[in-house]
């Protein structure tokens, strides 16, 4: 999980397997988004800083029966040293701001696109 | 459905520049990295760099850096590379191709384009 | 830099026989190894991600195998179309880097 979490600056090394396939599934959800994601439901915006993965599940657990979204949720589970569970909120949430889960989502996926580019692209 | 259309062949004299296109549809273009590969007459490919049209960033194979240029423009999901100081060594197909993040694979191609550098 | 080693150059097999194309790296790079099929006057086209993972679209008789630094792709009883030449690409690290490539052949 140290090795996991440690994704603030990646360098120019590819992501761990687990992180790859976080990526995937968020790339598969952004892609095949027909109807709105979870019905339109809304989620707390975040910060997408070092302890994101944590955030952005304390963000996303509190969607509930959304099949789409059930996989990532499981998927950031694996990235959260701590046990979250519904209603739970850390500093890193934007309480005044709530977004779409499909934007939230959309987010998360250029926010890591972003930082595995970094260490590459000038 | 995903194409990459590139500009036509080009014959250029050493030292000229030369500036391939390539024009992407059926996806979102800031999505995904445009990158450059090269293959001369006869043989294999070769690796010239990338592009993240969505921030203009790009990464180049030391080769090619400060005679290579790679842009892009959003609004009309074109990609560019430009090549200066031509060299009759640089004749080759030259195809674009994308990629989601630079270690993915190279999923869809453009069809090629032929400079011939010649006096 | 990553350097991508493929053997055998040339491969002269018959339709139906068995083809096993090789690629080595010099250090290792996990499973981030892609193959690619050119034919002559073509554009490449994907094959094989990740070192294993099959492309849909793609005949089943493709497959690919390895991690670290050597790597095999298979192609189970050839067709006629599959007479070409196959290249493999590090996706680990910039500079991208690909295989001189081996040419399959008609025996």
């Known amino acids: 999980l140290t090795c996991l979490g440690g994704f603030a600056s990646p360098g120019p090394v590819p992501p761990s397997t687990a992180l790859r396939e976080l990526i995937e599934e968020l790339v598969n959800i952004t892609q095949n988004q027909k109807a709105p994601l979870c019905n339109g439901s809304m989620v707390w915006s975040i910060n997408l800083t070092a302890g994101m993965y944590c955030a952005a599940l304390e963000s996303l657990i509190n969607v509930s029966g959304c099949s789409a979204i059930e996989k990532t949720q499981r998927m950031l589970s694996g990235f959260c040293p701590h046990k979250v569970s519904a209603g739970q909120f850390s500093s890193l949430h934007v309480r005044d701001t709530k977004i779409e889960v499909a934007q939230f989502v959309k987010d998360l996926l250029l926010h890591l696109k972003k930082l595995f580019r970094e260490g590459q692209f000038n | 459905q995903v194409q990459l259309v590139q500009s036509g062949a080009d014959v250029k004299k050493p030292g000229a520049s030369v500036k391939v296109s390539c024009k992407a549809s059926?996806?979102?273009?800031?999505?995904?990295?445009i990158h450059w590969v090269r293959q001369a007459p006869g043989q294999g490919l070769e690796w010239m760099g990338a592009i993240d049209p969505e921030t203009g960033g790009t990464a180049y194979n030391q080769k090619f850096k400060g005679r290579a240029t790679l842009t892009a423009d959003k609004s009309t999901s074109t990609a560019y590379m430009e090549l200066r100081s031509l060299r009759s060594d640089d004749t080759a197909v030259y195809y674009c191709?994308?990629?989601?993040?630079?270690?993915?694979?190279?999923?869809?191609w453009g069809q090629g384009t032929l400079v011939t550098v010649s006096s | 830099e990553i350097v991508l080693t493929q053997s055998p150059a040339t491969l002269s097999l018959s339709p139906g026989e068995r083809a096993t194309l090789s690629c080595r790296a010099s250090q290792n790079i996990s499973d981030y190894l892609h193959w690619y099929q050119q034919k002559p006057g073509q554009a490449p086209r994907l094959l094989i991600y990740?070192?294993?993972q099959s492309i849909s679209g793609i005949p089943a008789r493709f497959s690919g195998s390895g991690s670290g630094t050597d790597f095999t792709l298979t192609i189970n009883s050839l067709e006629p179309e599959d007479f070409a030449v196959y290249y493999c690409?590090?996706?680990?690290?910039?500079?991208?880097?690909l295989g001189g490539g081996t040419k399959v052949e008609i025996k």
């Open positions: 191709t994308r990629i989601l993040l630079y270690y993915y694979p190279m999923d869809y």
């Open positions: 059926g996806y979102t273009f800031i999505d995904y990295e």
């Open positions: 690409q590090n996706g680990h690290s910039f500079p991208l880097t």
């Open positions: 990740y070192a294993s």
